[in-house]
């Protein structure tokens, strides 16, 4: 059951930085306050190194991005949206190694990430697919390599 | 199960440093964090800092900034925690323990597994 | 670094009462805060994460409430076993804090 305490808290506190979302009851998280800086040498150092290891054997032509963010907190949002939400023809990413590092560098980098992830953590225990990579997985991971390229890259104008 | 086994009680004069490791069984090393904590006699508990070896990245109280360094090995499971300069005040039973998850399902930041605590006496 | 005000510093109490310690954030944590119990020549024990959540394991009696900086630990009826020492933790950021400690002691 949803821990209603929860909710009570929330909205009592209105100056917080947490929504909440009913479907799936995933609670989402305002990245404006991250150390970006720290999240950019966690990606440049080991996380962009597991998503090629993912998508080695595919060109990189092969997916056209349509994904896109425009400034560092909208790339993590998009970022967390792609990397732990189930979609269509990919039931989850969460397993693999670039999936739980971001979410490290999340928790350690995002003050307050990891409350907004209690209560979303019950929801995905119950939805635990079995790991497969499908053509669907590759495309949404090209995104994701897409989305931290333009997050470190955050000066650059939106095309 | 995760397990943290410390190293065991240490003698050191003033001025010079300890190391003191913390071993870790029963789970993924890289995906936790470890704290040290430290507690004089008596006294309460006192954060030092904490270290990430998923990033191999570690972060400290302002209190023992330049003065402490922790580390880990990911090859034995073990992170250290070295002091240096030290002095009388730094007599303390010294704490590790383990600090938040960064599994598939996401855990918080309380330090749930503890050490068995290390004494450090620093006497002339 | 944050700073952590735990309240009382030490209280007596007996075998049923209800107890509450607060511990008060030098600035806003939301609610990235942890209760621990800690007994003599022991490693403390957490009890509380995330302000309100019980650790597996830890009895119902227990319970935590606040967000912000005002936070609260409750023992609903005071067993034998809780005569202990209470510390308040803030895990905000990268950096963590210590409150002094309340010890509960025997009346």
């Known amino acids: 059951m949803f821990p209603f305490a929860l909710l009570y808290v929330l909205s009592v506190s209105f100056r917080k930085i947490f929504i909440l979302q009913l479907v799936g009851l995933v609670l989402t998280y305002d990245f404006t306050n991250c150390d970006f800086e720290k999240i950019k040498a966690a990606y440049l150092s080991t996380i962009s190194k597991d998503l090629i290891t993912y998508m080695s054997g595919t060109k990189s032509t092969e997916f056209n991005n349509t994904v896109s963010c425009s400034n560092r907190p909208h790339c993590l949002t998009e970022i967390q949206s792609l990397t732990f939400n189930p979609t269509a023809g990919c039931a989850s990413l969460a397993k693999e190694m670039f999936a739980m590092k971001t979410k490290a560098a999340l928790a350690i980098w995002c003050p307050g990430y990891s409350e907004t992830q209690i209560n979303a953590t019950q929801a995905m225990k119950k939805r635990r697919k079995r790991k497969v990579t499908t053509n669907k997985c590759l495309e949404q991971v090209s995104q994701l390599q897409g989305l931290w390229r333009r997050f470190n890259r955050p000066l650059l104008k939106q095309q | 199960q995760v397990q943290l086994v410390q190293s065991g009680a240490e003698v050191k004069k003033p001025g010079s440093s300890v190391k003191v490791s913390c071993k870790a069984s029963?789970?993924?090393?890289?995906?936790?964090?470890i704290s040290w904590v430290r507690q004089a006699p008596g006294q309460g508990l006192e954060w030092m800092g904490n270290?990430?070896?998923?990033?191999?990245?570690?972060n400290y109280a302002q209190k023992f900034q330049g003065r402490v360094t922790i580390t880990a090995d990911e090859s034995t499971s073990t992170a250290y925690m070295e002091l240096s300069s030290l002095r009388s005040e730094d007599t303390a039973v010294y704490y590790c323990?383990?600090?938040?998850?960064?599994?598939?399902?996401?855990?918080?930041?309380?330090?749930?597994?503890w050490g068995q605590g290390t004494l450090v006496t620093v006497s002339s | 670094d944050i700073q952590m005000t735990q309240s009382p510093s030490s209280l007596s109490a007996s075998v049923g009462d209800r107890v509450t310690i607060t511990c008060r954030a030098s600035?806003?944590?939301?609610?990235?805060l942890t209760w621990y119990q800690q007994k003599p020549g022991k490693a403390p024990k957490l009890l509380i994460y995330?302000?309100?959540s019980l650790q597996s394991g830890v009895p119902s009696r227990f319970s935590g409430s606040g967000s912000g900086t005002d936070f609260t630990l409750t023992i609903s009826s005071l067993q034998p076993e809780d005569f202990a020492t209470y510390y308040c933790?803030?895990?905000?950021?990268?950096?963590?804090?210590f409150g002094q400690g309340t010890k509960v002691e025997i009346k």
């Open positions: 323990a383990r600090y938040g998850q960064y599994g598939q399902h996401f855990s918080h930041g309380g330090m749930d597994v």
């Open positions: 029963g789970g993924t090393f890289s995906s936790y964090a």
């Open positions: 270290i990430y070896p998923i990033f191999g990245y570690a």
């Open positions: 600035q806003d944590i939301s609610i990235s």
């Open positions: 995330g302000a309100f």
């Open positions: 933790q803030q895990y905000y950021g990268t950096s963590a804090t």
